[in-house]
C-alpha cells in the first residue's frame, strides 16, 4: 500500500489545496488528503487520536476498493470478514466463522462440515478404497514350506481419506487361514533352529513324506508331535477347508 499524505501549497479556498504531494488530488493541512488522483483509493489512517486521509494504490486488509466515477475509496468488509472482494463476497472470515459461498457463518449448512484448518465449509468426504489386491502366498512365520496350515493376507489402498464427518474407511488388510500342499523345505529354506535340530528317525507306521502339522511350527521350541497316517491327513484336509476363517485388521 503506497500512502501519500498531502501538504497544502496553493490556497484554493478555505482549507483546500490542489498543490498536494504524492497521490493526493486535493488536500488540507488538518485532514491530509481530501481526494485522490485517479486509480488511487482514499482511506483514513489513524495517527494517535487523529484520523487523516491517505491515498493508497491498494486497500488494507479488512477493506476493499470501491470505484465510482472519479472517486475511489477503501470500504470496510463486513464485521465478520477479514478480507473481501466486495461488501457481499468475503474471501477470508474472522476467527470463529466459516466461509461458505462468500459469506461468513457461525455453523456450516446441512451436508457440509467445517474445515478448521482453512476455516471453510466443505463437502463431507467419505472414504474410498481400491479393489482388493490378490491374496499373498500362504505362509507361516514368513515361510511358504514345511507346514500344512498357515495364513494368507490381502490388502487394498485408501484412495480417498474421509473428512471429519465422512464415513470411516473399511478394513484395508484381511487375513485368513489357509492350507498348502505338503512341501518339504529345500536346503536353506528352513529356519536356523530347524537346521540345527537333530531330527528323530520316523517311527513305524509314519509316512516319510509327512510334514509336521502347523502346530508343530507354532512353538518356538518346535517339539515334534505324533505324525498322522495318510487317511487321517485326508480327513483333516477336508475339515481345514471348511474351517477356513477370515480375520480383518482395521487401519
Amino acid at each position: 500500500q503506497n500512502a501519500s499524505r498531502g501538504r497544502r501549497q496553493r490556497r484554493m479556498h478555505p482549507n483546500v489545496s490542489q498543490g498536494c504531494q504524492g497521490g493526493c488530488a486535493t488536500c488540507s493541512d488538518y485532514n491530509g488528503c481530501l481526494s485522490c488522483k485517479p486509480r488511487l483509493f482514499f482511506a483514513l489512517e489513524r495517527i494517535g487520536m487523529k484520523q487523516i486521509g491517505v491515498c493508497l494504490s491498494s486497500c488494507p486488509s479488512g477493506y476493499y476498493g470501491t470505484r465510482y466515477p472519479d472517486i475511489n475509496k477503501c470500504t470496510k468488509c463486513k464485521a465478520d470478514c477479514d478480507t473481501c472482494f466486495n461488501k457481499n463476497f468475503c474471501t477470508k472470515c474472522k476467527s470463529g466463522f466459516y466461509l461458505h459461498l462468500g459469506k461468513c457463518l457461525d455453523n456450516c449448512p446441512e451436508g457440509l462440515e467445517a474445515n478448521n484448518h482453512t476455516m471453510e465449509c466443505v463437502s463431507i468426504v467419505h472414504c474410498e478404497v481400491s479393489e482388493w489386491n490378490p491374496w499373498s502366498p500362504c505362509t507361516k512365520k514368513g515361510k511358504t514350506c514345511g507346514f500344512k496350515r498357515g495364513t494368507e493376507t490381502r490388502v487394498r489402498e485408501i484412495i480417498q481419506h474421509p473428512s471429519a464427518k465422512g464415513n470411516l474407511c473399511p478394513p484395508t488388510n484381511e487375513t485368513r487361514k489357509c492350507t498348502v500342499q505338503r512341501k518339504k523345505c529345500q536346503k536353506g529354506e528352513r529356519g536356523k533352529k530347524g537346521r540345527e535340530r537333530k531330527r528323530k528317525k520316523p517311527n513305524k507306521g509314519e509316512s516319510k513324506e509327512a510334514i509336521p502339522d502347523s502346530k508343530s511350527l507354532e512353538s518356538s521350541k518346535e517339539i515334534p508331535e505324533q505324525r498322522e497316517n495318510k487317511q487321517q491327513q485326508k480327513k483333516r484336509k477336508v475339515q481345514d477347508k471348511q474351517k477356513s476363517v477370515s480375520v480383518s485388521t482395521v487401519h
Epitope: 482549507n15 488536500c27 481530501l34 481526494s35 472519479d70 470500504t75
Partner: antibody, heavy 119, light 107 residues
Framework: EVQLVESGPGLVKPSETLSLTCTVS????????WNWIRQPPGKGLEWIGY???????YQNPSLKSRVTISRDTSKNQFSLKLSSVTAADTAVYYC?????????????WGQGTLVTVSS | DIQMTQSPSSLSASVGDRVTITCKAS??????LSWFQQKPGKAPKTLIY???RLVDGVPSRFSGSGSGTDYTLTISSLQPEDFATYYC?????????FGQGTKVEIK
Amino acid sequence: EVQLVESGPGLVKPSETLSLTCTVSGDSITSGYWNWIRQPPGKGLEWIGYISYSGKTYQNPSLKSRVTISRDTSKNQFSLKLSSVTAADTAVYYCATYYGYGGPFFAYWGQGTLVTVSS
Amino acid sequence: DIQMTQSPSSLSASVGDRVTITCKASQDIDSYLSWFQQKPGKAPKTLIYLTNRLVDGVPSRFSGSGSGTDYTLTISSLQPEDFATYYCLHYDEFPLTFGQGTKVEIK
C-alpha cells in the same frame, strides 16, 4: 468563498422534463464533485447525483433512468435534467459541492429553488 | 442501499439543555457520517463530518461521536439559534442517504 446559485423554471407540467442550472463562483467546477439534492415540502433530503471534476457522472439508482447531469465549464455551470416528472418530483432542489471523502461533505450549498410539478 | 434511521423524529428542549440525536446505519459506515442543521426556508448547513470533525466556524457546543453503525450528535448546551431540524448523512458508499431528520423545538 464558494457560492452556488440554482436557477430554472419554478413550474413544470407532469410528464415534461425539469431543467435546472447551478452557477458556481469562487471555485472551478474542474475540481471537486458537484451535486444535486432535493427536498420535497415538509420532508427529508434525497441525494440525486453528482458530476465530477472531469465531467463523469453518477446518479442515485432510484432516479437514474430519468436523470441527466451535465456541465458547461466555460460558464462554470452544471445542470440537472429530470424527465417524465410527476407530482412526487415537487421539491426544493439544491446544488452542493464536496472535495472528497476527507473533507466536509456538502460544505457549500446553493440557496435552493422550489420546483412545482402541476398542470 | 444503506438506510439511516434517525431518532427521535422530534424533541422539545429548553435553552441550556443537553440534547442528543442518534443515527443508526443499516450496516457499518466506518465513520463516514456528517451532521447538518437546517432552518425553515434555508439550505442545510454542515456541522460535522467524518463523525466528529467540526466544520470551521461551528460552535464547540456541537460534537459528534460513534463508530460502526451507531452515531450521535450532541449539543452540550442548547442555544436559541439551535432550534432547527438536524439531519445525518452517510457517505460510506453511493447512493448517499440522509436520515429522516430530527426537529428540535422549544419546550
